[in-house]
Interface confidence: low
């Protein structure tokens, strides 16, 4: 129902601690460059706005749009032309240009300093200090790094985080307890980041109807029991969540998650036997748990897809008189039986599905036409197939780090255009995938590999974006999401590629490198392998890996000499004339 | 293990009715589609008609109107009225590879069942 | 009509001759909708090769089907003493009611 004053409703709804979190994510996903502090007094002033407003909502401005009211504040800040530029223009538009204007100004790859932990002593003084503090930290630094990170989740990780930090300073070695700990909710973060840039991405480019698609696969694979219709209430449900949440509109997204989480918990019956233990936890725990939560078994007497969608002879009636119910149907009862393929799969396969129809549901005898496509699904299906085992393979033979060179190998030579720093994360998130994803269970991997690799793509995709330099990458790129991931897979060494000159001072290394953490050392060395393959494009596996072996070792004599400083100008340009023997 | 069964074969006298039955078993009737096709002896192998997962019957064109395939949860039938003495065969059912419904690929089969028709 | 016409009617070759086999349509079968069978005396046929050249699991590689539109070869690069048999070939149209068998091919031991 429509509420009087929409900042207090949402203040009521949420609480003033998810409030507070919500609007500081809000402000640092738009002006990624101001301090905490600058944030912080922004946050605390729209919180006494919204008492004002709960206390009365017929008070000054209390009737204004969300919108509204945070552009105005954001459009205050000083220095906003010196600080941000362009973004300033955003502020001389009405709503809702403005908002949008601000969502376009979103910086995917801010320049700001990567996100350094602070020793655990430190930690767990600040945290003890003010705890509420230590954590509006972390959610703004997080959020400015991140300005698509799905607002209701981050509350969750900033939740976990506490729980770390309550937990492990009152530990006697604090550091051994935090590290391992902090370290897993970073990564689940980072994945949890990537993944839902790529819902927003879906969304911008192509659409409700996209991820509503996306949706669908996803809950009939988790939800076979529930009937299309419970499917179908989840999907626009989630939808709406997601659209407000990559609109920035993040007290709308958080609250209608809650609802959403909710209904789903309210209605066990008619979704799904696994519920439960979720529906127990308090609210951040439960819509997480319920948002990764196992698939429920699939029903015993499903009968064989072909019955409704190939064998009826109304198939192109139904087709015609409701595309988007038939294909939604299609994707549903696909999917259900298919909790062993990646979502990406599942809408190729409908896509194939709708093509194949729309062809044949134009000619004389549809039947026979469309008589096959299960079939012609066969190779669409065998294709991630192979990708994941010859992968997988890869990786149980190499392991992460040496797994992740090859990738970077491979997508050198099929765009030695992009940006080296790119490259070498793109496949070090890449290679991640064999650790997160081949040591799981046969028919767990596909999904895990297909759908990791798109949302790691994505992110590829949008950097290019900002300075395309590969007609390959622009290529994958422009194309439909779910295909992009088979595009990259299928390019080949760019032929159009003048290698680049070789520079002695790209692999002159010094002492300094011997101090690195492992991390950083790994870069490193990868990003001197990136620009070998730059350098000899055509380079075999075998020369690339004499000469990293080489330079491995070189490392490692020149970091356990006595005089490290000495070891690296001598043997340094040694290893470079070795390297340009071993690639000539 | 997956079997197709046929029965119901005999001598009938032109004219006469017949209706052969394909008991399937290993599988369920209603994820495939099943044929039935027959051989004169010493002849050509000649398609009569399938029975879709989902129900819907197709007839060769010869054989519309005399022909008649139906199903029940384990069997196929094959109806045979106005039988002729060119109709004296050997009759299989068969089913179609699984994503094939509307080609003739045919992976399983009966061991067949004599139909005779004689005065 | 539907034509499907096999040659020869029949061959007569060795253990290890190299055997080859064609069907030919009129009209095109559609889609490459084209199989073979192999039929023993007494006993029900078995689909070797469909989609013209797909080979059917457990089908040794010694069979082979190449060809589209209206004709169509099997061949058996190295005939074995358990391939004396009678081949078939059945065609897909683009009604499923013209679904049509060649009359065979005998392969008998020389």
């Known amino acids: 129902e429509a509420h009087k004053s929409e900042i207090a409703h949402r203040y009521n709804d949420l609480g003033e601690q998810h409030f507070k979190g919500l609007v500081l994510i809000a402000f640092s996903q738009y002006l990624q460059k101001c301090s905490y502090d600058e944030h912080a007094k922004l946050v605390q002033e729209v919180t006494d706005f919204a008492k004002t407003c709960v206390a009365d909502e017929s008070a000054a401005n209390c009737d204004k749009s969300l919108h509204t009211l945070f552009g105005d504040k954001l459009c205050a800040i000083p220095n906003l032309r010196e600080n941000y530029g362009e973004l300033a223009d955003c502020c001389t538009k009405q709503e809702p240009e403005r908002n949008e204007c601000f969502l376009q100004h979103k910086d995917d790859n801010p320049s700001l300093p990567p996100f350094e932990r602070p020793e655990a002593e430190a930690m767990c003084t600040s945290f003890k200090e003010n705890p509420t503090t230590f954590m509006g930290h972390y959610l703004h630094e997080v959020a400015r790094r991140h300005p698509y990170f799905y607002a209701p989740e981050l509350l969750y990780y900033a939740e976990q985080y506490n729980e770390i930090l309550t937990q492990c300073c009152a530990e006697a070695d604090k550091e051994s307890c935090l590290t391992p700990k902090l370290d897993g909710v970073k990564e689940k973060a980072l994945v949890s980041s990537v993944r839902q840039r790529m819902k927003c991405s879906s969304m911008q480019k192509f659409g409700e109807r996209a991820f509503k698609a996306w949706a669908v696969a996803r809950l009939s694979q988790t939800f076979p029991n529930a009937d299309f219709a419970e499917i179908t209430k989840l999907a626009t449900d989630l939808t709406k969540v997601n659209k407000e949440c990559c609109h920035g509109d993040l007290l709308e997204c958080a609250d209608d998650r809650a609802e959403l989480a909710k209904y789903m918990c309210e209605n066990q019956a008619t979704i799904s036997s696994k519920l439960q233990t979720c529906c127990d936890k308090p609210l951040l725990k439960k819509a997480h748990c319920l948002s990764e939560v196992e698939h429920d078994t699939m029903p015993a007497d499903l009968p064989a897809i072909a019955a409704d969608f190939v064998e009826d002879q109304e198939v192109c009636k139904n087709y015609a008189e409701a595309k988007d119910v038939f294909l939604g149907t299609f994707l549903y009862e696909y999917s259900r039986r298919h909790p062993d393929y990646s979502v990406s799969l599942l809408l190729r396969l409908a896509k194939k599905y709708e093509a194949t129809l729309e062809k044949c549901c134009a000619e004389a005898n549809p039947p026979a036409c469309y008589g096959t496509v299960l079939a012609e699904f066969q190779p669409l299906v065998e294709e991630p197939k192979n990708l994941v085992k010859t992968n997988c393979d890869l990786y149980e033979k190499l392991g992460e780090y040496g797994f992740q060179n090859a990738i970077l190998v491979r997508y050198t030579q099929k765009a030695p255009q992009v940006s080296t720093p790119t490259l070498v994360e793109a496949a070090r998130n890449l290679g991640r995938v064999g650790t997160k994803c081949c040591t799981l269970p046969e028919d767990q991997r596909l999904p895990c590999v297909e759908d990791y690799l798109s949302a790691i793509l994505n992110r590829v995709c949008l950097l290019h974006e900002k300075t395309p330099v590969s007609e390959h990458v622009t290529k994958c790129c422009s194309g439909s999401l779910v295909e992009r991931r088979p595009c990259f897979s299928a390019l080949t060494v760019d032929e159009t590629y003048v290698p680049k000159e070789f520079k002695a001072e790209t692999f002159t290394f010094h002492s300094d490198i011997c101090t690195l953490p492992e991390k950083e050392k790994q870069i490193k060395k990868q990003t001197a392998l990136a620009e070998l393959v730059k350098h000899k494009p055509k380079a075999t596996a075998e020369q690339l890996k004499t000469v990293m072996d080489d330079f491995a070792q070189f490392l490692d004599t020149c970091c356990k000499a006595a005089d490290k400083d000495t070891c690296f100008s001598t043997e340094g340009p040694n290893l470079v004339t070795r390297c340009k023997d071993a690639l000539a | 293990e997956v079997q197709l069964l046929e029965s119901g074969g005999g001598l009938v006298q032109p004219g006469g009715s017949l209706r052969l039955s394909c008991a399937v078993s290993g599988i369920d009737l209603s994820n495939y589609a099943i044929n039935w096709v027959r051989q004169a002896p010493g002849k050509c192998l000649e398609w009569i008609g399938i029975?879709?997962?989902?129900?819907t019957t197709f007839y060769a064109t010869w054989a519309k109107g005399r022909f008649t395939i139906s199903r029940d949860s384990t069997t196929v039938y094959l109806q045979m009225n106005s039988l002729r003495a060119e109709d004296t065969a050997v009759y299989y059912c068969?089913?179609?590879?699984?994503?094939?419904?509307?080609?003739?690929?045919?992976?399983?089969w009966g061991q067949g069942t004599l139909v005779t028709v004689s005065s | 009509d539907i034509v499907m016409t096999q040659s020869p009617s029949s061959v007569s070759a060795s253990v290890g001759d190299r055997v080859t086999i064609t069907c030919q349509s009129s009209p095109s079968v559609w889609s490459n909708f084209l199989s073979w069978y192999q039929q023993k005396p007494g006993k029900a046929p078995k689909l070797l090769i469909y989609e013209a050249s797909k080979l059917t699991s457990g089908v040794p590689s010694r069979f082979k089907g190449s060809g589209s539109g209206t004709d169509f070869t099997l061949t058996i690069s190295s005939l074995q003493p358990e391939d004396f048999a009678t081949y078939y070939c059945g065609g897909g149209y683009s009604s499923i009611s013209d679904t049509t068998f060649g009359c065979g091919t005998k392969v008998e031991i020389k």
């Open positions: 029975i879709w997962a989902s129900g």
């Open positions: 068969a089913r179609t590879v699984p994503g094939y419904s509307t080609a003739p690929y045919f992976d399983l």
